[in-house]
Amino acid sequence: LQDLCSNCPAGTFCDNNRSQICSPCPPNSFSSAGGQRTCDICRQCKGVFKTRKECSSTSNAECDCISGYHCLGAECSMCEQDCKQGQELTKKGCKDCCFGTFNDQKRGICRPWTNCSLDGKSVLVNGTKERDVVCGPSPADLSPGASSATPPAPAREPGHSPQ
């Protein structure tokens, strides 16, 4: 005997109480694949979470965090406070990146500037708390014989003292 349930499309469930008729998913539930015996309850975005995508009969809701926070964990299971660019979140709150490190996002940790000399290059643009250094041509390429529009920038940012 062919299983009639396999004919039930996404957005419906196979209702055993009604001779395996395909019934629409009830409100606040969904089935993303065909042949389902039940519909799943939708994820609810409330409190620190806001709805990024509404639930439909065929797809679950998706949550985001309220303003000033960003998602952490699987499927945004928690929200963490944002910091400014040039900062990182510590146990005591948002702290500026130490000299020689940067963070160009509102989340995550400060990372060391790229060491241009490891690639045999020179610093073209200084690093800041918010931006990594930009590496340019190697010092050999900037010898008196080579044409260069601008001289290499100094290694340290003027007036930028360690934190």
């Epitope: 939708c42 994820r43 609810q44 409330k46 409190g47 620190v48 965090c65 928690m78």
Partner: antibody, heavy 124, light 107 residues
Framework: QITLKESGPTLVKPTQTLTLTCTFS??????????VNWIRQPPGEALEWLAL???????YYSPSLKSRLTITKDTSKNQVVLTMTNMDPVDTATYYC????????????????WGQGTLVTVSS | DIQMTQSPSSLSASVGDRVTITCRAS??????LNWYQQKPGKAPKLLIY???SLQSGVPSRFSGSGSGTDFTLTISSLQPEDFATYYC?????????FGQGTKVEIK
């Protein structure tokens, strides 16, 4: 430090209305993302969630008890009030309020911390 | 409503034992699963949130794992103060629902 404390009658008669107050400190119910929940526990039984109110006045209720419950807040007094009508002996339980939202720099839909609870007995 | 089923409902163990409690959801709840500890006459206390994150101040012998429908709370080395009842709770949708509890008793 966040603390919550429940208060209200310890004994109510069947058919009466129960009014419980949760008085809290260490957070404000005007802060975005914050909520207060009510949860109960009959003697020797498991926990049952009842109701929730958020900073923005959004309210949520247990579907099975929705017709009997009302949750309100008084932000200036740092209080949340739960009323439950038509009390029955099966409503005998310890009633807890619990904070939900952001503590420190992290937030989610979990209950932390809880008040100490208040035992309500329904009997004639 | 989403049903949460804990097993076992009770267990006897000795100090130093490794204890595992399981919790199953009636449908997938991703990582929206929290664990609480309750001692007699006291309010529940949050141990683990978002399935595996240890709440501040909770000893590292407690750990949580799992996602979807199956979750586990593990106490790596049971201490005298750990004898209590443990509850799982889903925060995926309203109403939030709890497991029926697992009572950890002294052997």
């Amino acid at each position: 430090q966040i603390t919550l404390k429940e208060s209200g009658p310890t004994l109510v008669k069947p058919t009466q209305t129960l009014t419980l107050t949760c008085t809290f400190s260490g957070f404000s119910l005007s802060t975005t993302g914050v909520g207060v929940n009510w949860i109960r526990q009959p003697p020797g039984e498991a926990l049952e969630w009842l109701a929730l109110i958020y900073w923005n006045d959004d309210t949520y209720y247990s579907p099975s008890l929705k017709s009997r419950l009302t949750i309100t807040k008084d932000t200036s007094k740092n209080q949340v009030v739960l009323t439950m009508t038509n009390m029955d002996p099966v409503d005998t339980a310890t009633y807890y309020c619990a904070h939900e939202g952001i503590i420190g720099f992290l937030g989610g839909n979990w209950f932390d911390p809880w008040g100490q609870g208040t035992l309500v007995t329904v009997s004639s | 409503d989403i049903q949460m089923t804990q097993s076992p409902s009770s267990l006897s163990a000795s100090v130093g034992d490794r204890v595992t409690i399981t919790c199953r959801a009636s449908q997938s709840i991703s990582s929206y699963l929290n664990w609480y500890q309750q001692k007699p006459g006291k309010a529940p206390k949050l141990l683990i949130y978002a399935a595996s994150s240890l709440q501040s101040g909770v000893p590292s012998r407690f750990s949580g794992s799992g996602s979807g429908t199956d979750f586990t709370l593990t106490i790596s080395s049971l201490q005298p103060e750990d004898f209590a009842t443990y509850y799982c709770q889903q925060s995926y949708s309203t109403p939030p629902t709890f497991g029926q509890g697992t009572k950890v008793e002294i052997k």
